[in-house]
Structure formats: structure tokens, C-alpha cells
């Protein structure tokens, strides 16, 4: 006999919620795998800045995305399938995963706060690599997409360490329309905007982390309530 009433409502709420979560994970994983295995992005491994080999921040970022996408898909599947099948085992595993993820998020939050300067440096390095790839390999549409995402999200363009050719390509092709780069290249420096984000606007990242944590707690409660509802319904 299946669950009834309010518990049934929780069942479908958990299903819908985790299905969206699973889809989002799939999108993230798909994009990350595309970036990782696309020949144009792979060129980043062999890219050189003058005489120095390029750092691999780009790849570290992609591997993090792959891991996040895979975990999201796995956890989403557990929640989805566990809810629809009314499986105490799957829901228990789902709850355990959420507890682990919650602990990871808290640990990552503490680590991130302590290492915010290093993270900002890595994000800047990631931007620089994507920008360099977009200029050197002018067919690298994924690198261009990364650069344009930075420019549009942070409302910036370029940095104070640009080469001549990069400046020219930026001005003519990769800067957001109406950007002040034309009148003064360094008015909207992306490096500065990244620094601002990790110092002055750190609370935004904090709010986002709290929202994710609240959703996790909400899902934990729902999965436990549903698990108890399933146990109770199987008694009768």
C-alpha cells in the first residue's frame, strides 16, 4: 500500500525537486565534458604564454564542474527514484548523501573564506587562460563563451595586463557593447571586478551558500518525513 495524504504530497514534491536537480546536474556535467574533450579547449594544455607554459587552472575548474555535475546527477537520481519507488533504502542513502554534501559545503565554505585570495587569483588565472585561448585560437568558441560570460556577468572587459593583440581583439569582438573599454581600457578591469567580488561582495556568495544549505536541510527533512511515512504505511 502506497503513502497517502500529506506524505503523498511530499513524495511528489521530492520527486519534482530532485528531477530538476538531476537535470541541472546533467547540464553541468554535459557542458563540463564538452569543455574537457573539445579539441579547441584541449589546446589549453599545450598553450604557452610567451616562453612560459600556461597554468592548468582551466582544467582544474573543468574537473570541479565534472565532479559537481556527477554528484548532482547521482544525488538527484537517488532522491527522484527513491521518492517515486517509495524505497526506504534509496531515501536513506539519499539522506546520507545530503548529510555528507552538507558537511562538505560547510567545510568548503570555511576553506573558501580562509583561502578567498587564492581562489580570486585562480579565477583571474582561469579568465586570463580563456581569454588567451580565445585570441590565440580564434576558432575556440567555448573559450569565447567563457570570456563573454565573465564580461557580461561582471560587467567588465579585459585586464590591466593585456597584450596589444588581445586589446584589439577584445575591443572589436569580445567586449560587451557599450563598454567603456573604448574610452579607457582599464575602467572596467575584470581582475579588479573579480577582486571586488571576493572581498566587497563576499556576502553574495555567503547568501548563495546559505540558500543551498537551507534547500539541503529542507530536502533532508522531506526525505526523513517520507521515509517515516513509508515505514508507517507498510505497518498497516
Amino acid at each position: 500500500m502506497g503513502v497517502e495524504g500529506c506524505t503523498k504530497c511530499i513524495k511528489y514534491l521530492l520527486f519534482v525537486f530532485n528531477f530538476v536537480f538531476w537535470l541541472a546536474g546533467g547540464v553541468i556535467l554535459g557542458v563540463a565534458l564538452w569543455l574537457r574533450h573539445d579539441p579547441q579547449t584541449t589546446n589549453l594544455l599545450y598553450l604557452e604564454l610567451g616562453d612560459k607554459p600556461a597554468p592548468n587552472t582551466f582544467y582544474v575548474g573543468i574537473y570541479i564542474l565534472i565532479a559537481v555535475g556527477a554528484v548532482m546527477m547521482f544525488v538527484g537520481f537517488l532522491g527522484c527514484y527513491g521518492a517515486i519507488q517509495e524505497s526506504q533504502c534509496l531515501l536513506g542513502t539519499f539522506f546520507t548523501c545530503l548529510v555528507i554534501l552538507f558537511a562538505c559545503e560547510v567545510a568548503a565554505g570555511i576553506w573558501g573564506f580562509v583561502n578567498k585570495d587564492q581562489i580570486a587569483k585562480d579565477v583571474k588565472q582561469f579568465y586570463d587562460q580563456a581569454l588567451q585561448q580565445a585570441v590565440v585560437d580564434d576558432d575556440a568558441n567555448n573559450a569565447k563563451a567563457v570570456v563573454k560570460t565573465f564580461h557580461e556577468t561582471l560587467d567588465c572587459c579585459g585586464s590591466s595586463t593585456l597584450t596589444a593583440i588581445t586589446t584589439s581583439v577584445l575591443k572589436n569582438n569580445l567586449c560587451p557593447s557599450g563598454s567603456n573599454i573604448i574610452s579607457n581600457l582599464f575602467k572596467e578591469d575584470c581582475h579588479q571586478k573579480i577582486d571586488d567580488l571576493f572581498s566587497g561582495k563576499l556576502y553574495l556568495i555567503g547568501i548563495a551558500a546559505i540558500v543551498v544549505a537551507v534547500i539541503m536541510i529542507f530536502e533532508m527533512i522531506l526525505s526523513m518525513v517520507l521515509c517515516c511515512g513509508i515505514r508507517n504505511s507498510s505497518v498497516y
Epitope: E48, L49, G50, D51, V135, V136, D137, D138, D139, S160, T161, L162, T163, A164, I165, T167, S168, V169, K171, N172, N173, L185, F186
Partner: antibody, heavy 119, light 112 residues
């Protein structure tokens, strides 16, 4: 050895057209930005245009914008400059140059081809 | 009138040290764009002499050196030789004009 060889220069009347070519060898042409730089007789150097490795990006000096067009054929390792509506002030030796991304400059130059615009 | 200003001529005797200046502005050399130097021997194409303010490509003698300070750059030639007689051009990028800019050129004469 890196080699760049320009051709196509000559005498042309004002308002006329000319197409310059630059045959290259000794380096991976298809992965390099290329450029044209000119030098009027007895004068200094003036950058004219550049084109990216796959022709996605290009730019021109204001003095030639709308009249000159840069292009390349990577299968032939050749760079081109289509010059239309030529003026007397376009008279110059036109050099094709490889643009080095790492060094951010023109690291190899051809010997140049003379374009004379006169009636 | 060139965006980068160079003296039109310079001279020296063999063995002497000669310096050629290149003055720009805050939109080119002063904006952090590297200065490069080219040597053009009579009747030939320009040849890269110094890149990135002070680096020498392989094959360029260490008699040639470059430096940059603020909105200016300079090329120094020590132990001057007769084969150094040529035109020297400085080059940078101007962010306001969005063009690669060259100096007007300096004609170096080796006396005696």
C-alpha cells in the same frame, strides 16, 4: 627558415584596385596572426591591417578602413590584401609581417612590394 | 606627425655608445604596452631588434639593449660599428587609437 614573399605591386591610377599576395614558408602559417605594414617613400612605417589565424578577427588602420580588405588562404600559406579606391597617399612599399602572439610584435618581415598610385 | 616621437637623426664614431629615445604617452608606452625596436638597413625590410622593452631575439648582438621608463623607451647601442648604420624604429600599441604605432624613425650615422 621563415620566408615571406610579397607580390602584386605596381603602378595603378587613383581610384583603381590592386591585390597584393604574400607567400609564406618555414613556419606554421595557419596558426599565426599575419599583418600588413607599409612605408611611404622616404617616410616611416605605418601599420595597415592584421588578420587572425582562422580569419575570425581582423582590423584596419582608419586611413584604409572601408577600402582595403585582408584575407588569407591557409591551404596555400598565402596572405592577401585587396586594395580598392586607391589614392596617391597609398603609394608605399607594402610589407607582409608575421605577428608573434608570444612576443606581441611583428617578428618576421617580407622584402616588400612597391605600390605606386599615380595618374 | 608620429604618435611615438624619435629624434630624426643620431650619430657616433666607431666604438662609441649611442642612445635613441622614443617618447610616447599614457595611451601607449605608459599604458603598459611593450615597446619593440626594429632596424632597417638601407634598401632592406625592417628586422626585429628588441622586443618586450628589453629582450633580444636570438642572433642580435648584446651590444644592443633596450629599456623603458614611464611613457618613454630607449635603445642603446654600445661599441658602435659601421654596419650599425641604419634607420631605427620604435613600436608600441595605442589603446585610444586602437592601432599599432611606430616612431618616425631615427637615422643612425656612423662617423669616420
Amino acid at each position: 627558415e621563415v620566408q615571406l614573399l610579397e607580390s602584386g605591386g605596381g603602378l595603378v591610377q587613383p581610384g583603381g584596385s590592386l591585390r597584393l599576395s604574400c607567400a609564406t614558408s618555414g613556419f606554421p602559417f595557419s596558426s599565426n596572426y599575419m599583418s600588413w605594414v607599409r612605408q611611404a617613400p622616404g617616410k616611416g612605417l605605418e601599420w595597415v591591417s592584421y588578420i587572425s589565424s582562422s580569419s575570425t578577427y581582423s582590423d584596419y588602420a582608419d586611413s584604409v578602413k572601408g577600402r582595403f580588405s585582408i584575407s588569407r588562404d591557409n591551404s596555400k600559406n598565402t596572405l592577401y590584401l585587396q586594395m580598392n579606391s586607391l589614392r596617391a597617399e597609398d603609394t608605399a612599399v607594402y610589407y607582409c609581417a608575421r605577428y608573434s602572439y608570444g612576443r606581441d610584435n611583428f617578428d618576421y618581415w617580407g622584402q616588400g612590394t612597391l605600390v605606386t598610385v599615380s595618374s | 606627425q608620429s604618435v611615438l616621437t624619435q629624434p630624426s637623426s643620431a650619430s657616433g664614431t666607431p666604438g662609441q655608445r649611442v642612445t635613441i629615445s622614443c617618447t610616447g604617452s599614457t595611451s601607449n608606452i605608459g599604458a603598459g604596452y611593450a615597446t619593440h625596436w626594429y632596424q632597417q638597413l638601407p634598401g632592406t625590410a625592417p628586422k626585429l631588434l628588441i622586443y618586450g622593452n628589453s629582450n633580444r631575439p636570438s642572433g642580435v648582438p648584446d651590444r644592443f639593449s633596450g629599456s623603458k621608463s614611464g611613457t618613454s623607451a630607449s635603445l642603446a647601442i654600445s661599441g658602435l660599428r659601421s654596419e650599425d648604420e641604419a634607420d631605427y624604429y620604435c613600436q608600441s600599441y595605442d589603446t585610444n587609437l586602437s592601432v599599432w604605432v611606430f616612431g618616425g624613425g631615427t637615422k643612425l650615422t656612423v662617423l669616420g
